[in-house]
Amino acid sequence: IWELKKDVYVVELDWYPDAPGEMVVLTCDTPEEDGITWTLDQSSEVLGSGKTLTIQVKEFGDAGQYTCHKGGEVLSHSLLLLHKKEDGIWSTDILKDQKEPKNKTFLRCEAKNYSGRFTCWWLTTISTDLTFSVKSSRGSSDPQGVTCGAATLSAERVRGDNKEYEYSVECQEDSACPAAEESLPIEVMVDAVHKLKYENYTSSFFIRDIIKPDPPKNLQLKPLKNSRQVEVSWEYPDTWSTPHSYFSLTFCVQVQGKSKREKKDRVFTDKTSATVICRKNASISVRAQDRYYSSSWSEWASVPCS
């Protein structure tokens, strides 16, 4: 058993049918010695008396808010949560496996640049009685500070007969050095509590591996005289690291017809302009990627050919 926060404790339970459970001793936070009784949640049934209460925690029915009283007055509370292990594996019931980029991916994180700021998000089908707490550091043995905000509900969507909820959190490395080679990964830890169930999820990454630039901005077309060709131009996104001479992007320019079946013409360039043939009813899209490290491409920025 360990303390998650004041008066909230997590019991680690290795569960299997007929498991003996964990013996837990609760102590009433009071100078009083006599006449103390214990109850669980809203029940008035007295579970025991005395300054300590010994319970055998075998299942969620044994978790909850234990309260010690004297003469009708509440003395203190202890909320017991369960962290359940089955077949040697800690439960991961609260969050949905996003399966991207691999199975058992519960947390996904992205950074728009090398500033040390990043966003992580996760999915759940649970709508109520749910809390998250996020901590982060660079490295784990001698951790350097990363400050995370509060996790917030960022999207809701319907998937079949299921409603899915997306939560996200923003974090910032306290002493980020954008140009430095990373040797220690960022560690992100999410505590999830649903009703009386505690679970924790972790992710470890280098900022360079989670970079996803914003789409190029100010995408414009300039027709070339007496030609079906156009000059496409764009700019680096505002959120990208500076100076651009050091933090350089490469770009992919795509001409796509109205039909998805039509052949796509693609041009790769390090410049912020390109000349392409603009077909009728086609659209031109441009996306960006770090020039020197193959992390994610940005989303497309698009304009119609007409």
Epitope: W15, Y16, P17, D41, E59, F60, G61, G64, E86, D93, T125, I126, G160, D161, N162, K163, H194, K195, L196, K197
Partner: nanobody
Framework: EVQLVESGGGVVQAGESLRLSCAAS????????MGWFRQAPGTEREFVGT????????YYADSVKGRFTISRDNAKNTVFLQMSSLKPEDTAVYYC????????????????WGQGTQVTVSS
């Protein structure tokens, strides 16, 4: 929200078997841990057993262990309670419930309940 409807209750002789079904509709059934409870006249609702969302683990009250078996078919949104070697003291209204916590024997931990089906075991 999940709506639950029990069926399969009836009158049987002691020592016989009965299979109860609980059909779920509404939100995704496979997200929920499912439990069975029972209530005899003049008594509190009593835990019978529960099955986890994947159907891989079950947990039973001592009074029914070895006689009752819970299973589920997530493709058909149904949970079953197979009762054998029935005794007169098994007479009760049987309720199906859906919740998020497995295992739990407390009704507090179940969010959705069916209306119940009567099982009578005569001697």
């Amino acid at each position: 929200e999940v709506q639950l409807v029990e069926s399969g209750g009836g009158v049987v002789q002691a020592g016989e078997s009965l299979r109860l079904s609980c059909a779920a509709s509404g939100r995704s059934f496979s997200n929920y841990e499912m439990g069975w409870f029972r209530q005899a006249p003049g008594t509190e609702r009593e835990f019978v057993g529960t099955i986890n969302r994947r159907g891989s683990s079950t947990y039973y009250a001592d009074s029914v262990k070895g006689r009752f078996t819970i299973s589920r078919d997530n493709a058909k949104n149904t949970v079953f309670l197979q009762m054998s070697s029935l005794k007169p003291e098994d007479t009760a209204v049987y309720y199906c419930a859906a919740g998020w916590l497995f295992p739990s024997s407390l009704s507090r931990d179940y969010d959705f309940w069916g209306q119940g089906t009567q099982v009578t075991v005569s001697s």
